[in-house]
Interface confidence: low
Amino acid sequence: QEEDLPRPSISAEPGTVIPLGSHVTFVCRGPVGVQTFRLERDSRSTYNDTEDVSQASPSESEARFRIDSVREGNAGLYRCIYYKPPKWSEQSDYLELLVKESSGGPDSPDTEPGSSAGPTQRPSDNSHNEHAPASQGLKAEHLY
């Protein structure tokens, strides 16, 4: 008998409010044994698959999808789904990504032409993070 697959979860590091031009990493989590994680966009048949899956804990696996330079078009709803042979899971809850066009803080005026808000905090590895694997996963640039 096939096991019931738990729903995946989705989160974003460092957050869901991202300055224009900064980076964001979507983190999809599921049970151990996941072969493929898929990050899906809302209202479009667009997605990104990765088999770069790491074990985040004894009972959890994880994949990371990074966007190096967030644009206005990246704003929207995202969700995860995974493939654990022989079947696909349900989708995760939606996560909404907000893109802020500002140069000094969420409430500051729009960025001047030619300038770009800086990238968000970017831990380049996770050796001090017990919840995350060493792998940073694949860039999600072709998702869009």
Partner: antibody
Framework: EQSVEESGGRLVTPGTPLTLTCTAS????????MIWVRQAPGEGLEWIGD??????ATYYASWAKGRFTISKTSTTVDLKITSPTTEDTATYFC??????????WGPGTLVTVSS | ELDLTQTPASVEVAVGGTVTIKCQAS??????LSWYQQKPGQPPKLLIY???TMASGVPSRFSGSGSGTQFTLTISDLECADAATYYC????????????FGGGTEVVVK
Amino acid sequence: EQSVEESGGRLVTPGTPLTLTCTASGFSLSSYAMIWVRQAPGEGLEWIGDIYAGGGATYYASWAKGRFTISKTSTTVDLKITSPTTEDTATYFCARAYGSGYDLWGPGTLVTVSS
Amino acid sequence: ELDLTQTPASVEVAVGGTVTIKCQASQSISSYLSWYQQKPGQPPKLLIYYASTMASGVPSRFSGSGSGTQFTLTISDLECADAATYYCQQGDSRSNVDNIFGGGTEVVVK
């Protein structure tokens, strides 16, 4: 208006656990990474650790691992000093991540560890 | 281990002058560097992030530059109100890091 404020600082004896709380106003903690920093009297800024939005991933300074624990609720970010020593006497700040830096800082809360 | 070295530790500059503070990273941090101003009894104030992007409300007399391992904060047309301690901060690696802040530079305005 957006702000953060630390609380919980007080005089404690060595070894007595202490939890500091960072409370956010005007924005959602679920959307931002937050940092804890301390500053001993007359000294520079010392990073303790930070906690990320979403999954709540935590990162600690190498010297702080095991000595401090950062956690969050929907409205607060907490810093637990597990077993304070006199060297932990300092003003403790929390701040919100923005860009490669931290744009919104609390006024700080003073922790004094003395027997 | 990634650390930041700030120079000088202290500098005295006349009103109207220019001060340059340097921050050197022990390994490349791309442009993930920020600068802060701190006055006694106050929390740090973000001046510059992403090496050269000015934070909201910061006077144009403050400018940041650099990438990789070498970064500079320049304050021109110095005013008395600029007397403070300035810190750099890296926003790149969190692995085996003792501190993400530089040691600070005290700016004395005479």
